[in-house]
Interface confidence: low
């Protein structure tokens, strides 16, 4: 998921214009803002800041419970809240503190949580 | 979530080394491979390919159901499966087909799905 293929035809060093083009013109940034709270596998968002990275701020999801919220609003431990993870690309200053030289870096972030049936091991 | 802050202290054009450094050394890429099927809000993954973009292949999640899977294995339409979305950074060839000149682009991708309580509108 996410950038999980290494493109072999790309050159090693390239020029990149950091003036971001945002393709998300039709999206309402608040439309999923409360999923973290309404989910049966709710999560909290934690700020991860690193001035040597672009973007410098990334939000990490941490599931609130081991189990999932049932219809009564209680935690059901027969189900599991698990993080949905995605590899994303970021730019890392290289060498450190460099103003205009970066290296592409792949990092794994937790985007949110989902409720799954646990893997049951049957004993003979 | 994801790269959602614009860093004002960055220069406009930079050099980027595309030899990716992967920080996910301790992660098993398949460890969450079956969440899409075990989730109460299961999803399918769809390939989005664009040779003008780096990475050229991105995976998009599409929730299988409007509702969520209940304990009986049936779809419960009193709950909603919704996509968890994240903004990610990609490189877009600029001008088109350029071999070594890119522009940073922000796109919204659906990473997976979560089950949420629907918004209920109460009629007076």
């Amino acid at each position: 998921m996410g950038p999980n293929s290494e493109d072999k035809n790309f050159p090693r060093t390239v020029m990149v214009n950091l003036n971001i083009h945002n393709r998300n013109t039709n999206t309402n940034p608040k439309r999923s803002s409360d999923y973290y709270d309404r989910s049966t596998s709710p999560w909290n968002l934690h700020r991860n800041e690193d001035p040597e990275r672009y973007p410098s701020v990334i939000w990490e999801a941490k599931c609130r419970h081991l189990g999932c919220i049932n219809a009564d609003g209680n935690v059901d431990y027969h189900m599991n809240s698990v993080p949905i993870q995605q590899e994303i690309l970021v730019l890392r200053r290289e060498p450190p503190h460099s103003p205009n030289s970066f290296r592409l870096e792949k990092i794994l972030v937790s985007v949110g949580c989902t409720c799954v049936t646990p893997i049951v091991h049957h004993v003979a | 979530m994801g790269p959602n802050s614009e860093d004002k202290n960055f220069p406009r054009t930079v050099m980027v080394n595309l030899n990716i450094h992967n920080r996910n050394t301790n992660t098993n890429p398949k460890r969450s491979s079956d969440y899409y099927d075990r989730s109460t809000s299961p999803w399918n993954l769809h390939r989005n390919e664009d040779p003008e973009r780096y990475p050229s292949v991105i995976w998009e999640a599409k929730c299988r159901h409007l509702g969520c899977i209940n304990a009986d294995g049936n779809v419960d339409y009193h709950m909603n499966s919704v996509p968890i979305q994240q903004e990610i950074l990609v490189l877009r060839r600029e001008p088109p087909h350029s071999p070594n000149s890119f522009r940073l682009e922000k796109i919204l991708v659906s990473v997976g799905c979560t089950c949420v309580t629907p918004i209920v509108h109460h009629v007076a």
Epitope: - | Y36, D37, L45, H46, R47, N48
Partner: antibody
Framework: QVQLQQWGAGLLKPSETLSLTCAVF????????WNWIRQPPGKGLEWIGE???????IYNPSLKSRVTISEDTSKNQFSLRLNSVTAADTATYYC??????????????????WGQGTPVTVSS | DILMTQSPSSLSASVGDRVTITCRAS??????LGWYQQKPGKVPKFLIF???SLQSGVPSRFSGSGSGTDFTLTINSLQPEDFATYYC?????????FGQGTKVGFK
């Protein structure tokens, strides 16, 4: 041009295990859904199951207790195992590539490349 | 499971005829339907996805329509190579399910 080549035992006795392998030539293994379908003599097509690009499997519930689909990405191959076969499992078995295609903001699915088919007879 | 019912199960036609095959789903599948052609002893061939989009290389005499539960495959001006069995396949949900097939034979 992508081609699928399949092989495996064509004659089995009841209670034995059917084992078929499908190799992908001339195209990427990553990024598609790899399916098995069967067709009893003179009858229609029945979907058995699929394995996706991250190793997740989904099976037809009618066969789920007996079927296993696995992959060997290093060889660009995927396999089908069907346990405890009976005469009702006599059929031509096909492997096929599942692909998702976008139209607007929606995705559609199709089995665009098929193996040559392997006739399997179960007889005592 | 979503049951896909095709009709007719067989039909006889002549070269140049306009042929219509229908496929009915047991529940709403939006436009998540494809069509496949299979000739005797041959592998199925992918014709149409998403109800009406032709797969690359498929002649324009083939067309699809419908939405929800009722779908149609139409062959305008039937050609000799079109005599075959046609199957619909729903991809709205798992398990994927095929219609039982419609055999188009010579009149």
């Amino acid at each position: 041009q992508v081609q699928l080549q399949q092989w495996g035992a064509g004659l089995l006795k009841p209670s034995e295990t059917l084992s078929l392998t499908c190799a992908v030539f001339g195209g990427s293994f990553d990024g598609y859904y790899w399916n098995w379908i069967r067709q009893p003599p003179g009858k229609g097509l029945e979907w058995i199951g699929e394995i996706n690009h991250i190793g997740g499997t989904i099976y037809n519930p009618s066969l789920k207790s007996r079927v296993t689909i696995s992959e060997d990405t290093s060889k660009n191959q995927f396999s089908l195992r069907l346990n405890s076969v009976t005469a009702a499992d006599t059929a031509t078995y096909y492997c096929a590539r599942g692909i998702t295609m976008g139209r607007g903001n929606y995705y559609y699915y199709g089995l665009d490349v098929w193996g040559q088919g392997t006739p399997v007879t179960v007889s005592s | 499971d979503i049951l896909m019912t095709q009709s007719p199960s067989s039909l006889s036609a002549s070269v140049g005829d306009r042929v219509t095959i229908t496929c009915r789903a047991s529940q709403d599948i939006k436009n998540d339907l494809g069509w496949y052609q299979q000739k005797p002893g041959k592998v199925p061939k992918f014709l149409i996805f998403g109800t009406y989009s032709l797969q690359s290389g498929v002649p324009s005499r083939f067309s699809g329509s419908g939405s929800g539960t009722d779908f149609t495959l139409t062959i305008n001006s039937l050609q000799p190579e079109d005599f075959a069995t046609y199957y619909c396949l729903q991809d709205n949900n798992y398990p994927r399910t095929f219609g039982q097939g419609t055999k188009v034979g010579f009149k």
